[in-house]
C-alpha cells in the first residue's frame, strides 16, 4: 500500500523538516527558516511559535519540531503547551481580579498559585488542633481531646533507661 | 497593523528620573491592560509594572514598590512609566505588552521591541 500511495503520490515521500514544493515539481524543499514540519508529507511548514514578552524559550524550533516557551520567573504556565502565563502571588495569597489579595482569616495557600482554601475542622475527626493555622499553613490536627483527659499526654514519654548487667523483667 | 513602541530610554545618573513611554496603534487600546517588563544584560527577564484597562496599578517587582509609578492617557493610547531614584540595578531593557489583564498574559498579546536605560555615573 505504501508503495502504491508513493506512486500516486510524489509528496508522501518528503519526510518531517521538509514540504513538498508545488512550485518546483512537487519536490522536497527544506522547510525555510523559523518554519517546521514535525510530520512527512506536508505541503507547507508551519510557523514556529516566538516566545515574546512574558514567555521564554524552553525549547528552540528546530526544522522537525515547534519551539516551547514557559514563563519569566514570577508567573507560571497556564493552558495547552504553555498557552498563558498567570502571575505567580506570596504564599498566603491567592490572586483575584484585582491582583493578588492575603487570604480571608480561616483561609490558607501554601503555594504561589491557586485559591485560598479553609482551615481543616478538626472537630469533624473528633480531634482537637495542635498548631493554630496561618494565611500559609493549615492547623495541625493533634488527639481527639479525650485523649487529652487530665494525666494523659499527648506526647509517648521515652523508655525508662536499663542498668547495665540488668535483663528486663 | 499593532504595533506597541516603546520610548524615552536614555543613560542617567543614579538617584535620577526618567519617563518611559509605551505608544500604542492599531487596536483598542482602551480594552487592554500595559505591562512593563525588563531585562538586564545577562540576567532573567523580570516583571516591573502593570495598568488595567481601567487605570488599576499591579507592581510586579517590589524592588520598585515607591520609586517607579504607572499611568495611561487613553486619548494619546500610550502608557507611562516614571522612575525616580534610579540605582545602577534599574539598568536594562524595557519593553511593554498588552494583555487584556494585568495578571494573565497570553502567547498572542502584543508586544513591543524595548528601549534602553542605563544608570550609570
Known amino acids: 500500500f505504501e508503495r502504491t500511495r508513493s506512486l500516486q503520490d510524489p509528496c508522501s515521500n518528503c519526510p518531517a523538516g521538509t514540504f513538498c514544493d508545488n512550485n518546483r515539481n512537487q519536490i522536497c524543499s527544506p522547510c525555510p527558516p523559523n518554519s517546521f514540519s514535525s510530520a512527512g508529507g506536508q505541503r507547507t511548514c508551519d510557523i514556529c511559535r516566538q516566545c515574546k514578552g512574558v514567555f521564554r524559550t524552553r525549547k528552540e524550533c528546530s526544522s522537525t519540531s515547534n519551539a516551547e516557551c514557559d514563563c519569566t520567573p514570577g508567573f507560571h504556565c497556564l493552558g495547552a503547551g504553555c498557552s498563558m502565563c498567570e502571575q505567580d502571588c506570596k504564599q498566603g495569597q491567592e490572586l483575584t481580579k484585582k491582583g493578588c489579595k492575603d487570604c480571608c482569616f480561616g483561609t490558607f495557600n501554601d503555594q504561589k498559585r491557586g485559591i485560598c482554601r479553609p482551615w481543616t475542622n478538626c472537630s469533624l475527626d473528633g480531634k482537637s488542633v495542635l498548631v493554630n493555622g496561618t494565611k500559609e499553613r493549615d492547623v495541625v490536627c493533634g488527639p481527639s481531646p479525650a485523649d487529652l483527659s487530665p494525666g494523659a499526654s499527648s506526647v509517648t514519654p521515652p523508655a525508662p533507661a536499663r542498668e547495665p548487667g540488668h535483663s528486663p523483667q | 497593523q499593532v504595533q506597541l513602541q516603546e520610548s524615552g530610554g536614555a543613560l542617567v545618573q543614579p538617584g535620577g528620573s526618567l519617563r518611559l513611554s509605551c505608544a500604542a496603534s492599531?487596536?483598542?487600546?482602551?480594552?487592554?491592560?500595559i505591562g512593563w517588563f525588563r531585562q538586564a544584560p545577562g540576567k532573567e527577564r523580570e516583571g516591573v509594572l502593570c495598568i488595567s484597562s481601567s487605570g488599576g496599578s499591579t507592581y510586579y517587582a517590589d524592588s520598585v514598590k515607591g520609586r517607579f509609578t504607572i499611568s495611561r492617557d487613553n486619548a494619546k493610547n500610550t502608557v507611562y512609566l516614571q522612575m525616580t531614584n534610579l540605582k545602577p540595578e534599574d539598568t536594562a531593557v524595557y519593553l511593554c505588552g498588552a494583555p487584556r489583564d494585568c495578571s494573565r498574559y497570553s502567547s498572542d498579546d502584543y508586544w513591543g521591541q524595548g528601549t534602553q536605560v542605563t544608570v550609570s555615573s
Open positions: 492599531g487596536f483598542t487600546f482602551d480594552d487592554y491592560a
